[in-house]
């Protein structure tokens, strides 16, 4: 009954669990026997240029419960939120609240999701309803993307979900892809 307060957008944040918690252990699964050799997807960065690689952006660790209607994940999941402006790596502060944002006088760079992974979650429901199993997409890494004059303010508002959809990853790091519905909301929170 107490769960009715949770939003139905899978963004319930629990900062008390720490700003940089360890990611939850991966669920056990037996995929080793039937894996395609070299089946991963090669990296593909259509927007990256030499100067983009010199920029860096914040990856804020987020711990939260996943919700689906009245149901909530049995355990919290940890993901990243891509935060704010990009700047030269050497000028970026190490933590929130220290230093000043560096703003380029020339082209604008934004910190956006680069890669996603999928994670299995079990959702517990109130009132004796049967538990649910879902797979959720979580941000795995962020990147700086150079904005062009074609990106207007309305596009920026929804930048995390439309303007630069992240790609799928490849081994060795488990990653998935696709724009999360509420990434822009989380970005704006910072």
């Amino acid at each position: 009954q107490g769960w009715q307060a949770f939003k139905n957008d899978a963004t319930e944040i629990i900062p008390e669990l720490g700003e940089y918690p360890e990611p939850p252990p991966e669920l056990e699964n037996n995929k080793t026997m039937n894996r395609a050799e070299n089946g991963g997807r090669p990296p593909h960065h259509p927007f990256e240029t030499k100067d983009v690689s010199e920029y860096s952006c914040r990856e804020l660790h987020f711990t939260r419960y996943v919700t689906d209607g009245p149901c909530r994940s049995a355990k919290p999941v940890t993901e990243l939120v891509c935060s704010g402006q990009c700047g030269p790596a050497r000028l970026l502060p190490n933590a929130i609240g220290r230093g000043k944002w560096w703003r380029p006088s020339g082209p604008d760079f934004r910190c956006i999701p680069d890669r996603y992974r999928a994670q299995r979650v079990q959702l517990l429901c109130p009132g004796g309803e049967a538990p649910r199993a879902r797979k959720v997409r979580l941000v795995a890494s962020c990147k700086c993307k150079r904005l062009t004059r074609f990106h207007n303010q309305s596009e920026l508002k929804d930048f995390g979900t439309e303007a630069a959809r992240p790609q799928k990853g490849r081994k060795p790091r488990p990653r998935a892809r696709s724009a999360k519905a509420n990434q822009a909301e989380l970005e704006n929170a910072y």
Epitope: K135, Q167, N182
Partner: antibody, heavy 121, light 110 residues
Framework: EVQLVQSGAEVKKPGASVKVSCKVS????????MHWVRQAPGKGLEWMGG????????IYAQKFQGRVTMTEDTSTDTAYMELSSLRSEDTAVYYC??????????????WGQGTLVTVSS | QAVVTQEPSLTVSPGGTVTLTCGSS?????????PYWFQQKPGQAPRTLIS???DKHSWTPARFSGSLLGGKAALTLSGAQPEDEAEYYC?????????FGGGTKLTVLG
């Protein structure tokens, strides 16, 4: 909206290979998990393999391991499924299918129109 | 490899209710198999009705529902319509590898 358009029908001889293409529009291929499913005439659906976003790899069904290769050309947003050492029982309609772009991972939401591959001597 | 079993054929009267089931040779079907249900009509590609046991899609008619029943995945059709006559396939996820059932041919009499 994701749309998948597959290449046309093929007739192959036993022992040959076939490469079926699946062109994605509406989204980019790198955003999607592409899977391949086949259906022999009058028979049921059979999963051949696809991209697994949990570990970022392509996984093949045991039955096709070593005989099937699934690749992608991200510059043209086209996925390919190549099946080698063809035999008559590989005669089937081959489908590509992808997930949706959203918060929850849902596979097999969008399907190509199918490509009929006939293996005959 | 696991074998997924379905009833080969079922019949329902218009307006009636029918339940299709989907079993696994490995034992009980659970939510961790993320059961999918597909509908396929002759000459058409399949279309997804249910994902993750019970999750309907925007195009899924309300008369279809998914559940777990007696150790199997189940698709229940309440208030069958003539247009529901089709082949229905279930699909189970075995740790990233998928296996389809043999399909159930559903006939709507009338």
């Amino acid at each position: 909206e994701v749309q998948l358009v597959q290449s046309g029908a093929e007739v192959k001889k036993p022992g040959a290979s076939v490469k079926v293409s699946c062109k994605v529009s509406g989204y980019t291929l790198t955003e999607l998990s592409m899977h391949w499913v086949r259906q022999a005439p009058g028979k049921g659906l059979e999963w051949m393999g696809g991209f697994d976003p949990e570990d970022g790899e392509t996984i093949y069904a045991q039955k096709f391991q070593g005989r099937v290769t699934m690749t992608e050309d991200t510059s043209t947003d086209t996925a390919y499924m190549e099946l080698s050492s063809l035999r008559s029982e590989d005669t089937a309609v081959y489908y590509c299918a992808t997930d949706t772009v959203g918060y929850w991972e849902k596979f097999f939401q969008h399907w190509g129109q199918g490509t009929l591959v006939t293996v005959s001597s | 490899q696991a074998v997924v079993t379905q009833e080969p054929s079922l019949t329902v009267s218009p307006g009636g209710t029918v339940t299709l089931t989907c079993g696994s040779s490995t034992g009980t079907v659970t939510i961790d198999h993320y059961p999918y249900w597909f509908q396929q009509k002759p000459g058409q590609a399949p279309r997804t009705l249910i994902s993750d046991t019970d999750d309907k899609h925007s195009w899924t008619p309300a008369r279809f529902s998914g559940s777990l029943l007696g150790g199997k995945a189940a698709l229940t059709l309440s208030g069958a319509q003539p247009e529901d006559e089709a082949e229905y396939y279930c699909l189970l996820d075995y740790g990233g590898r998928f296996v389809f059932g043999g399909g159930t041919k559903l006939t709507v009499l009338g």
